[in-house]
């Protein structure tokens, strides 16, 4: 569903997008993800902030918690206990890193309509969750884990060694949160709540990144974060499991690390409970091309966890790193020993495999020159997954169902023909036993969320169709979008081109390349967006292009692993190649070509500007990496190896932005960074600026005081206004 295009009769009522539209979020869309609480019931927070329970079978709805109760403690979030006797209410949200935050929690007793008094929770809490059955509570406070059998009970302290920036229990440290798990929690209840598993991260030997936070005080604060950069000492991780029924009986029991992993530096990558007495742990060598999946069983006699070598499954990559961005997680079948998992097949495409005994004997479930992306749910007779198979567009996502009860297994695309023009990029959310599911379509048309019967796939109702957005866009001249591919030297380069509303192939337009280009990323996706680049095309008449080159995902290992140990080479080459092809199309003004990117995209845009091709007149780098020696170990080493002489130090040195300072002389460069960036440290831009000054190269720069990697709030408005002025000046467009 795209708003109707311009007809001559309407032309004077139609208007272009404005920058204000974008900054105000005028054309943002809504999605609807049910908070499933059973096979047929879900919760949803209504527009007026009531918590409403919906029963799909009967069509009835029930307000289980009024907005009055929510407001009484300023709650912005909630969580119903599985026995439906209590609700936690979350307030005083205080963001920390990407996922982590602290909050104050209140427990509301649904049986008497009052808040639980006595043995209240401490504040602020770092993480809190209900057990999967009943109403036990686990929470993390000051880096230690606590357990309550019932909300009104006194807490049982599970760990005692938690210390800020030193020992983290039940929550990840910075690098595990951002690059490995990636979640705000590191504790996992067993399916019926008998056991609680948790990770302990020891950061005592990790070097600390320190930066100033200016605030309003006379003296700036210093933020200290244990942050392992490439080659530095890493966190030491241990996994423990405690019996929550009798927590004091034997205490936490450590789960052994597989011998082949423990022989050198390693990571823990995920934990999956199979049953109450069987758990699956995934481990990864520091050189991230070997992953081990270890299935462990509870020994009642010894009260310990046993991980036999016969239940270790090794996943190894010979051409790159293990997995895609992360090593995939197993989805266990009902027999509680076999599982489904996505990994590379012999042709180098990520596909679903069924592992019963050994990885070598894995049965391949999907195959083809496309990739399986996510396994949503396995039931007794069906497996639901997403892939980009349909019509061979890698930037699409459709949901499929494979029948696993019958032989041969039959495959059905659930979404391919539902709303074919409007919807080509889906995700799904399933109720218990996949009795029902919600589909969330992200585009290319206006997003829509729908509810479906899990047996027949029949649509039951529309959950959110963004009618207001559709109406608001009726008089807007949106740019045209096309997704196509270039074939260059046996490489397929998919691109998205965003064209001005009255695009005319016989005219010449300025071109802006928007790049991310990081390993296992994808920019060319069939999704809806009205954003800054939509405005640049609609109002300012620019052509914008996004190109997925080597190193990007979901098109096979050949493209993905091409950048292994060589970051900053092929990603840049492929952007340049695409620009040359765009020029050949005849509608690009070759004297007005720019490139911009954020984060990894800032790195690529900087290298492209400094490539010496003369293609780019100007460009912008927002919060760029400038040297891989400055970035996090887990991410960087996955793709680059170690910065040591006997490993890959040479390419670490060759791939810096600073090494190309001289080449910025003939381009207009705008460098932007937040001073409180915990992720890509301000250090990166400081070093670029220093190198440019030392080379006596002129450039423009903007810093955002006390802003992190997201440059949010008022900084966002300033940022996009500033970048707009820069580009309009570069392209000689009148203000």
């Amino acid at each position: 569903l795209r708003p109707s295009r311009v007809h001559n009769s309407e032309e004077n009522t139609m208007r272009a997008l404005t920058l204000k539209d974008i900054l105000n979020g005028t054309f943002s869309y809504k999605t609807f993800f049910p908070n499933w609480i059973s096979g047929q019931e879900y919760l949803h927070q209504s527009a007026d902030n009531n918590i409403v329970l919906y029963n799909i079978e009967t069509g009835q709805s029930y307000t289980i918690l009024s907005n009055r109760t929510m407001k009484s403690v300023n709650a912005s979030n909630y969580g119903l206990s599985p026995d439906r006797q209590f609700v936690y209410l979350e307030s005083d949200y205080s963001k920390l890193w990407r996922y982590s935050y602290t909050a104050t929690y209140y427990i509301y007793d649904l049986s008497n309509g009052e808040f639980v008094r006595g043995n209240e929770l401490p504040r602020p809490i770092q993480y809190l969750c209900w057990s999967p059955v009943g109403s036990k509570l686990a929470y993390v406070y000051q880096n230690n884990i606590y357990l309550k059998q019932r909300p009104g009970d006194p807490p049982f302290q599970i760990t005692f060694n938690g210390r800020e920036n030193k020992i983290f229990n039940g929550i990840p440290d910075w690098v595990y949160e951002e690059e490995m798990l990636p979640t705000k929690y590191a504790l996992w209840w067993s399916p019926n709540g008998k056991f609680l598993a948790y990770a302990e991260f020891n950061d005592k030997d990790i070097p600390v990144i320190a930066y100033s936070y200016y605030g309003d005080e006379q003296y700036p604060r210093t933020i200290n974060i244990p942050y392992p950069k490439a080659g530095a000492k890493n966190p030491v991780v241990r996994i423990f499991i405690i019996d929550t029924t009798y927590p004091a009986y034997v205490g936490p029991q450590e789960v052994p690390v597989p011998a082949m992993i423990a022989s050198s530096d390693y990571y823990f990558s995920w934990l999956t409970w199979v049953t109450d007495e069987r758990v699956c742990l995934q481990w990864l060598k520091r050189v991230q091309n070997v992953s081990v999946l270890s299935i462990c069983d509870f020994r009642e006699d010894w009260q310990t966890w046993d991980c036999p070598k016969t239940q270790e499954h090794i996943e190894e990559s010979r051409t790159g790193w293990a997995g895609g961005f992360f090593v995939s997680r197993p989805v266990f079948s009902y027999d509680a020993i076999s599982y489904y998992k996505i990994f590379s097949d012999k042709d180098g495409y990520k596909h679903i495999h069924y592992i019963k005994d050994t990885v070598e004997n894995a049965i391949q479930i999907t195959s083809g020159k496309w990739e399986a992306i996510n396994i949503f749910r396995v039931t007794q007779d069906s497996l639901f997954y997403s892939s980009n198979e349909f019509e061979e567009y890698p930037g699409r996502r459709n949901i499929y169902r494979i029948s696993i009860g019958s032989y041969p297994p039959s495959k059905k695309c659930v979404t391919c023909h539902l709303r074919k023009e409007r919807c080509q990029y889906y995700t799904a959310s399933f109720s218990d036993y996949a009795k029902y599911y919600a589909l969330v379509c992200y585009g290319p048309g206006i997003p829509i969320s729908t509810l479906h019967d899990g047996r027949t796939d029949q649509e039951i109702k529309i959950l959110e169709e963004n009618k207001e957005l559709e109406n608001a866009l009726k008089n807007i001249q949106l740019p045209k979008e096309e997704i196509k591919k270039l074939e260059v030297d046996e490489i397929t380069l998919w691109y998205k081109m965003i064209l001005p509303p009255q695009f005319d192939r016989s005219k010449k337009y300025p071109l802006l390349i928007q790049v991310y280009g990081g390993p296992c990323s994808q920019s060319v996706r069939s999704v809806f967006a009205v954003n800054w680049i939509s405005y640049l095309a609609s109002k300012e008449g620019m052509v914008i292009a996004l190109v997925d080159g080597r190193g990007t995902a979901f098109q096979g290992d050949k493209l993905l692993y091409a950048v292994y140990r060589k970051l900053g080479v092929y990603e840049v080459e492929d952007q340049i190649t695409a620009v040359r092809k765009f020029i050949e199309m005849g509608f690009i003004d070759e004297k007005r070509i720019a490139i911009w990117g954020w984060s990894y995209g800032g790195y690529v845009s900087s290298l492209a500007l400094a490539s010496g091709t003369g293609l780019f007149k100007c460009g912008i780098a927002v919060a760029p990496v400038s040297s891989w020696e400055y970035y996090a170990s887990v991410y960087t080493e996955r793709f680059m190896g170690l910065p040591t002489k006997d490993d890959n130090l040479e390419h670490y040195k060759n791939s810096t932005v600073m090494a190309r300072a001289e080449y910025f002389r003939n381009v207009d460069y705008l460098l932007i960074h937040g001073t409180a960036d915990d992720n890509v440290h301000f250090q990166n831009s400081a070093q670029i600026a220093k190198a440019l000054v030392n080379a006596q190269v002129d450039f423009q720069a903007m810093w955002y005081s006390d802003q992190n990697h997201g440059l949010s709030g008022l900084s966002t408005n300033h940022l996009y206004t500033h970048m707009t002025h820069f580009l309009k000046q570069c392209f000689s467009l009148s203000d």
């Epitope: 096979g39 047929q40 329970l53 029963n55 439906r84 006797q85 049986s111 008497n112 309509g113």
Partner: nanobody, 123 residues
């Protein structure tokens, strides 16, 4: 084991009122959550109202403000006062019980049931 017996159903005109009663056997009545369900011909049995052991109530949005559930633990009885009745309220009304929380709307979560009482609202 709880035995339940409904009464108070009948024929009533639109906008009229009825009061349903459900008498329960068993000494631990006070510890059970109690609910009223209804089933119209060809439709699923749906929860109309529920009351927890602590007296907290839950209503279907379609009856909120018109129906009131209450309990008398001394008499082992739960009531459903139905006002401003509409033709679409016509159904067999069932009393149900469960140990634990009241905030369950699926039929399968309520193990104990009465025989039902017919309520007919004429227009």
């Amino acid at each position: 084991q709880v035995q339940l017996q409904e009464s108070g159903g009948g024929l009533v005109e639109a906008e009229g009122s009825l009061r349903l009663s459900c008498a329960a056997s068993g000494r631990t009545f006070g510890s059970y959550a109690m609910g009223w369900f209804r089933q119209a011909p060809g439709k699923e049995r749906e929860l109309v109202a529920a009351i927890s052991s602590g007296g907290s109530t839950l209503y279907a949005d379609s009856v909120k403000g018109r129906f009131t559930i209450s309990r008398d633990n001394a008499k082992n009885t739960v009531y459903l006062q139905m006002n401003s009745l509409k033709p679409e309220d016509t159904a067999v009304y069932y009393c149900a019980a469960r140990s634990g929380g009241a905030y369950y709307t699926a039929r399968v979560d309520w193990p104990y049931w009465g025989q039902g009482t017919q309520v007919t609202v004429s227009s």
